[in-house]
């Protein structure tokens, strides 16, 4: 939050597009404008692609291919700057979801692969569960080649995958990708779905 009640969120989608959004509770029914630059000595440009919420501006989308520079921005109410800041946008990375996810079964193990993203410092996480698991199990690797062992071929397993930026590389402000679609497998073949995970029975109350 800022001193004037303007809450800012920055997301750098896959090192391609920067999204800056705000929650201007102190400025109801105002169309705040967004002005930005990537060099301190340049003049500000105004946003050309606004995000609207209930008919009012609530964010801006910027093309910023493979940028690791500072974004300088000013959010204004008319000509009055409401909030001015600069951020290293690289630290707000949200990788794209895993693409071309494929499964290779060999007895009681499966290797999940997908297309590696073009930049480094990422973790590829695969989660899986059977109807007997109340929570997802997880395994992650530095490349999108994750082998999960000791599975029961007779059980139906649901799988999903995502990409995370390593904190050691990108700091604490990143976002994990969205999950890939859940896919279900049993005996090495795809299934439309698995039975819902069983919830433990509630104890009966004695009279």
């Amino acid at each position: 939050a800022t001193g004037e009640g303007l809450q800012i969120q920055i997301i750098y989608f896959n090192l391609e597009t920067v999204q800056v959004t705000w929650n201007a509770s102190h400025y109801p029914r105002s169309n705040l404008s967004f002005h930005y630059k990537f060099s301190r000595d340049e003049a500000y440009d105004q946003c050309t692609v606004y995000i609207l919420q209930e008919g009012h501006t609530s964010g801006c989308l910027l093309d910023a291919e493979q940028q690791d520079d500072i974004l300088y921005f000013s959010i204004r109410n008319g000509t009055h700057p409401v909030f001015t800041a600069s951020r290293w946008i690289f630290y707000y990375l949200k990788p794209s979801s895993p693409k071309q996810v494929s499964f290779s079964w060999h007895q009681d193990a499966v290797t999940v692969t997908c297309s590696d993203l073009s930049y480094r410092g990422l973790l590829y996480e695969v989660q899986y569960r059977s109807p007997f698991d109340t929570e997802w199990q997880s395994k992650q690797e530095n490349t999108c080649n994750v082998t999960i062992e000791d599975l029961d071929a007779e059980k139906c397993y649901a799988f999903r995958a995502r990409v995370k930026a390593m904190e050691d590389a990108y700091g604490p402000d990143t976002y994990p990708s969205d999950w890939s679609e859940v896919t279900c497998w049993q005996r090495g073949e795809t299934r439309d779905s698995c039975p819902e995970p069983r919830t433990p029975p509630k104890p009966k109350l004695s009279k």
């Epitope: 690791d68 800041a85 290293w88 050691d168 590389a169």
Partner: antibody, heavy 118, light 107 residues
Framework: EVQLLESGGGLVQPGGSLRLSCAAS????????MHWVRQAPGKGLKWVSS????????YYADSVKGRFTISRDNPKNTLYLQMNSLRAEDTAVYYC???????????WGQGTLVTVSS | DIQMTQSPSSLSASVGDRVTITCRAS??????LAWFQQKPGKAPKSLIY???SLQSGVPSKFSGSGSGTDFTLTISSLQPEDFATYYC?????????FGQGTKVEIK
């Protein structure tokens, strides 16, 4: 463990040049923006310069713009500050600092002393 | 550039005292404020970031608060190792700027 080790400081005459180095370890150097901050004897801290992880983006305090150049060699995990046309007022301990996103200037080197005097 | 003003410039306190240092920014910096501790002949050490978050390994006797333009650093019970100079820094808007420092001395 994050470590930043500066070197290259020393005594130099006004108008002279010096190159400071900072050897980094314990984190993914190529992804981290880096900074130089200086402190004149008995004075406070002053930001000098910053560089983005790729080295493409460079930023300078007005007092050093045109005289100092920040750069980095990511394969060698090393940050540099090339200082030209040095002045007496550049005399300070120079610190190499790691950028931590919202965590700010989260790790500092031990510093290297630059003395500009005739 | 954003000016950062710390007060007091120096203070004398005893072991066990509660100490508060304030920092004021010349414009709204959200919560992008850090506090550093520096002992003579040593590098600064980061204590607090985003106004109130403790850096890893920093003891909980240090706390920070504030947002916008007014911030405080509190040491709940001063110990001998806490006698040092403390700096605030804004990193909301480039160039990053530091306060002039507050020297905490033994009474």
């Amino acid at each position: 463990e994050v470590q930043l080790l500066e070197s290259g400081g020393g005594l130099v005459q006004p108008g002279g040049s010096l190159r400071l180095s900072c050897a980094a370890s314990g984190f993914t150097f190529r992804s981290s923006a880096m900074h130089w901050v200086r402190q004149a004897p008995g004075k406070g801290l002053k930001w000098v310069s910053s560089v983005s992880g790729s080295g493409a983006g460079t930023y300078y305090a007005d007092s050093v713009k045109g005289r100092f150049t920040i750069s980095r060699d990511n394969p060698k995990n090393t940050l540099y500050l090339q200082m030209n046309s040095l002045r007496a007022e550049d005399t300070a301990v120079y610190y190499c600092v790691k950028e931590g996103g919202s965590r700010g200037f989260d790790y500092w080197g031990q510093g290297t002393l630059v003395t500009v005097s005739s | 550039d954003i000016q950062m003003t710390q007060s007091p410039s120096s203070l004398s306190a005893s072991v066990g005292d509660r100490v508060t240092i304030t920092c004021r920014a010349s414009q709204d910096i959200s919560n992008y404020l850090a506090w550093f501790q520096q002992k003579p002949g040593k590098a600064p050490k980061s204590l607090i970031y985003t106004a109130s978050s403790l850096q890893s390994g920093v003891p909980s006797k240090f706390s920070g608060s504030g947002s916008g333009t007014d911030f405080t650093l509190t040491i709940s019970s001063l110990q001998p190792e806490d006698f040092a100079t403390y700096y605030c820094q804004q990193y909301n808007l480039y160039p990053p700027t530091f306060g002039q420092g507050t020297k905490v001395e033994i009474k």
